[in-house]
């Protein structure tokens, strides 16, 4: 039980996708103000984004030092302009976010077909490799630096004139796929982490057709 | 505990239709592709089709293309297969099959089978 | 389509017996390459996926391995459970195909 004029925050909600992640809770404040605070299982909490009336904080740079570790939150409430006030217990009043382990719960942002090329009938397919906000060396690693071959790619691939997507596989970013010569054909790619059993797929990537200007055709 | 459960097999004369049910628990179909397989009396295993119910996407073995539809209703998390213009070869148990979508690309749990006969 | 080309279509073997069964694809399938196990009225069950390793909770008698465009299931020492029919089957691309199934008898 907090002073009268302040409420918990509750809702507490985790989004994040390609490690970029962001608190959420309600509700809108009403004067009073929110500081959230993080922390590993075993690590001391950390405060961020102090006295605000947002109700959502951005948290990747506390989670991308250790994207394996599981992380806890919680959201203080404070009455707007008096932020020394407490709760009748004499501690503001707080409520705690579920745990979230960024490797394990990270969605998958929807990827990008980088190019294709076709040299007879065997055409080459690569996915971009995203740039997440996880470092090591002060530099930016790709999603499939940080997945390695946890990460796969599925390849749904399809003549213009036919409806029937066919698949193939790949844990690089990079397809080298049969088809028919004279045909085109269209593709989509989706991300997936099979050892996942929730957030394992992305969505799928925008539709790229042969024909187009990202392919590249040499008769062989 | 995962579990795929098919029904809705049966008799149907040649030229007929029946839907096929496969009712998935302790997972959700959104997140893998469905397959079904099919196995005549007496003989090996056959693939009939697949969907990824995230986007719809299908495709068939020629044998079945354009009779069967498959199909996916994530809220119920349950994938279907609309079999028309049966055929006395369609005679089998029908499995459906989970794909975790794995490079290997193994069908890592199965149903038990709905048998449909296709006889007059 | 991928031919997966299953061999023997059958075998006898006594319990203890080293068994092995082939399947050879008609072009490559990389690793992409799972065996099933079933018995009769039942489903297949997975034992072996990307050619080599083993699924969870199947004895570890049962291993996979490959050469090129073969591929081979061994049980090291056949156990009475072990009788059934055998099947490998590809997914390297769509469709998938199965081998023709191996069935292993009592001798």
């Known amino acids: 039980s907090g002073t009268t004029n302040t409420v918990a925050a509750y809702n507490l909600t985790w989004k994040s996708t390609n490690f970029k992640t962001i608190l959420e809770w309600e509700p809108k404040p009403v004067n009073q103000v929110y500081t959230v605070q993080i922390s590993t299982k075993s690590g001391d909490w950390k405060s961020k984004c102090f006295y605000t009336t947002d109700t959502e904080c951005d948290l990747t740079d506390e989670i991308v030092k250790d994207v394996k570790q599981t992380y806890l939150a919680r959201v203080f409430s404070y009455p707007a302009g008096n932020v020394e006030s407490t709760g009748s217990a004499g501690e503001p009043l707080y409520e705690n976010s579920p745990e979230f382990t960024p490797y394990l719960e990270t969605n998958l942002g929807q990827p990008t077909i980088q190019s294709f090329e076709q040299v007879g009938t065997k055409v080459n397919v690569t996915v971009e490799d995203e740039r997440t906000l996880v470092r090591r060396n002060n530099t930016f690693l790709s999603l499939r630096d940080v997945f390695g071959k946890d990460l796969i790619y599925t390849l749904y691939y399809w003549k213009s004139s036919s409806s029937g997507k066919k698949t193939a596989k790949t844990n690089t970013n990079e397809f080298l796929i049969d088809v028919d010569k004279g045909e085109n054909y269209c593709f989509s790619v989706q991300a997936v982490i099979p050892s996942r059993t929730v957030n394992r797929k992305s969505t799928d990537s925008p539709v790229e057709c042969m024909g187009q200007e990202k392919g590249e055709f040499r008769e062989i | 505990e995962v579990q795929l459960v098919e029904s809705g097999g049966g008799l149907v004369q040649p030229g007929g239709s029946l839907r096929l049910s496969c009712a998935a628990s302790?997972?959700?179909?959104?997140?893998?592709?469905i397959h079904w397989v099919r196995q005549a009396p007496g003989k090996g295993l056959e693939w009939v089709g697949y969907i990824d119910p995230s986007n719809g996407y299908t495709y068939y073995a020629d044998s079945v293309k354009g009779r069967f539809t498959i199909s996916a209703d994530t809220s119920k998390n349950t994938a279907y297969l609309q079999m028309n213009s049966l055929r006395a070869e369609d005679t089998a148990v029908y499995y459906c099959a989970r794909d975790p979508q794995s490079v290997g690309s193994e069908f890592d749990y199965w149903g038990q089978g709905t048998l449909v006969t296709v006889s007059s | 389509d991928i031919q997966m080309t299953q061999s023997p279509s059958s075998l006898s073997a006594s319990v203890g017996d080293r068994v092995t069964i082939t399947c050879r694809a008609s072009q490559d399938v990389n690793t992409a390459v799972a065996w099933y196990q079933q018995k009769p009225g039942k489903a297949p069950k997975l034992l072996i996926y990307?050619?080599?390793f083993l699924y969870s909770g199947v004895p570890s008698r049962f291993s996979g391995s490959r050469s090129g465009t073969d591929f081979t299931l061994t049980i090291s020492s056949l156990q009475p459970e072990d009788f059934a029919t055998y099947y490998c089957q590809q997914h390297y691309t769509t469709p998938p195909t199965f081998g023709q199934g191996t069935k292993v008898e009592i001798k």
């Open positions: 990307s050619a080599s």
């Open positions: 302790g997972f959700t179909i959104f997140d893998y592709i």
